[in-house]
Amino acid sequence: APVLPGEDSKDVAAPHSQPLTSSERIDKHIRYILDGISALRKETCNRSNMCESSKEALAENNLNLPKMAEKDGCFQSGFNEDTCLVKIITGLLEFEVYLEYLQNRFESSEEQARAVQMSTKVLIQFLQKKAKNLDAITTPEPTTNASLLTKLQAQNQWLQDMTTHLILRSFKEFLQSSLRALRQM
C-alpha cells in the first residue's frame, strides 16, 4: 500500500538526522502526490487512448479545473509570495471534488488514488499553517461540489475517461507550478 510522507521510517528523525523543516515537508508532500499522479496516469493511458489525444482536442471540455495564471503571482514575472500561497491553497481546495471523482475510476491503482486524495488534504493543512493571509482563501460550496460530482459521474464512459485524463494532467501541471513557486519563497 502507498505510504504517505511522514509515515515512512525515513521521516522519523534518526539519531543523527534533523527533523524536516516546514518547507521540506511541503516539498516532499507535493513530490509524493506527483509520483502518485504519475502511477495513475500510467493506468489511464494503458486502458484508453486519451494520452495520445492532442492538447487542443482535450481543451474542448467544460471542466473548470484550477489553473495558474499570471495574476496569481506564482510565476517568475510578477511573483508575489502571499498571493501565490493563497492561489495554491484555493486551487487545491477546488481540486478536492475532482480527486473525489477519481476514487472509483481506478482498478489496480485504487489505493494510489486514495493516497493522492489523503495526501492532498494533509498538504492543504500544511500550507494553511504557512499562509498569513487566510482571509482571502475561499472554500468551495459543499452543495456545488456535490452537484458537480453527480454530473461528472453521470457522463458516458468515453467522457469519464476524458475527464479522468484531464484531471490528472491539470493536477500535475498545477502541482509542478506550485512546487517551483514554493521553492522560490
Epitope: 518547507s23 521553492r183 519563497m185
Partner: antibody
Framework: VKLQESGGGLVQPGGSRKLSCAAS????????MHWVRQAPEKGLEWVAY????????YYADTVKGRFTISRDNPKNTLFLQMTSLRSEDTAMYYC???????????WGQGTSVTVSS | DIQLTQSPASLSASVGETVTITCRAS??????LAWYQQKQGKSPQLLVY???TLADGVPSRFSGSGSGTQYSLKINSLQPEDFGSYYC?????????FGGGTKLEIK
C-alpha cells in the same frame, strides 16, 4: 550578471570560515541562490540552496548541521557560514543563481577553501 | 536520495561527429533535470534545463531529451569549443545531486 565569491583560504580542521558572494547586474532579491563545490580533480557537488525570501532553505546531507546559507537582499550578498570543517570540505566553492526551475543559470568564478593542519 | 549515473565516464570524438551522453536516475525525477558544460579551470555553464529546454545563448546543436529515469544530452556536429566535462543534475528531491560527469576529449 556577475557573481563574485570571496572568503576562501586555508583553515584548520574543526575551524570555521564564512564565504560571501557579491551579486550584481540583476535584481538579487528575485532569485533563489545555490552554493556548489568541487573538490580538486573531482565532480560537482551541490551544497545548499536558499529561496528569494529565505523561507526555503535546503542542504546536502554532508553539510547539514555544519553549514548555514543566508542572504542579505538589500546588500545583494549571499553567504555560506562553514563550521566544524573537515579535510573533505576542501574544494572550490561556487555561488550560482537559480532560474525558475532550480537550474543554475549563472555561476561565479569560485573561491578556494583548503582544510588542512 | 536520488542517484544519477552518467555514461560514458569519458568519450573521445572528432570535430563534426555527433555524440550522446546519458544520465540515469535511481527514481522518477519528472524532467526536473539540467545539463552543464565545464571547461578545464572554468566555472560550469548551464546548457539545458527541464530536461529539454535550451538555456539562453546555447547553440542549437545541443539538445536534451528524456523522461522518468532516463535522460540524454545530444551534441550534433561537434565543434572544437565543445570539448570539456558535462554534468547532469536533478532538482526533484533534495539533495539535488549531480551525475559523476562525462569527459569529452578530442580524438
Amino acid at each position: 550578471v556577475k557573481l563574485q565569491e570571496s572568503g576562501g583560504g586555508l583553515v584548520q580542521p574543526g575551524g570555521s570560515r564564512k564565504l560571501s558572494c557579491a551579486a550584481s547586474g540583476f535584481t538579487f532579491s528575485r532569485f533563489g541562490m545555490h552554493w556548489v563545490r568541487q573538490a580538486p580533480e573531482k565532480g560537482l557537488e551541490w551544497v545548499a540552496y536558499i529561496g528569494r525570501g529565505s523561507s526555503t532553505i535546503y542542504y546536502a546531507d554532508t553539510v547539514k548541521g555544519r553549514f548555514t546559507i543566508s542572504r542579505d537582499n538589500p546588500k545583494n550578498t549571499l553567504f555560506l557560514q562553514m563550521t566544524s570543517l573537515r579535510s573533505e570540505d576542501t574544494a572550490m566553492y561556487y555561488c550560482a543563481r537559480s532560474n525558475w526551475d532550480g537550474a543554475m543559470d549563472y555561476w561565479g568564478q569560485g573561491t578556494s577553501v583548503t582544510v588542512s593542519s | 536520495d536520488i542517484q544519477l549515473t552518467q555514461s560514458p565516464a569519458s568519450l573521445s570524438a572528432s570535430v563534426g561527429e555527433t555524440v550522446t551522453i546519458t544520465c540515469r536516475a535511481s527514481g522518477n525525477i519528472h524532467n526536473f533535470l539540467a545539463w552543464y558544460q565545464q571547461k578545464q579551470g572554468k566555472s560550469p555553464q548551464l546548457l539545458v534545463y527541464n530536461a529539454e529546454t535550451l538555456a539562453d545563448g546555447v547553440p542549437s546543436r545541443f539538445s536534451g531529451s528524456g523522461s522518468g529515469t532516463q535522460y540524454s544530452l545530444k551534441i550534433n556536429s561537434l565543434q572544437p569549443e565543445d570539448f570539456g566535462s558535462y554534468y547532469c543534475q536533478h532538482f526533484w528531491s533534495t539533495p539535488w545531486t549531480f551525475g559523476g560527469g562525462t569527459k569529452l576529449e578530442i580524438k
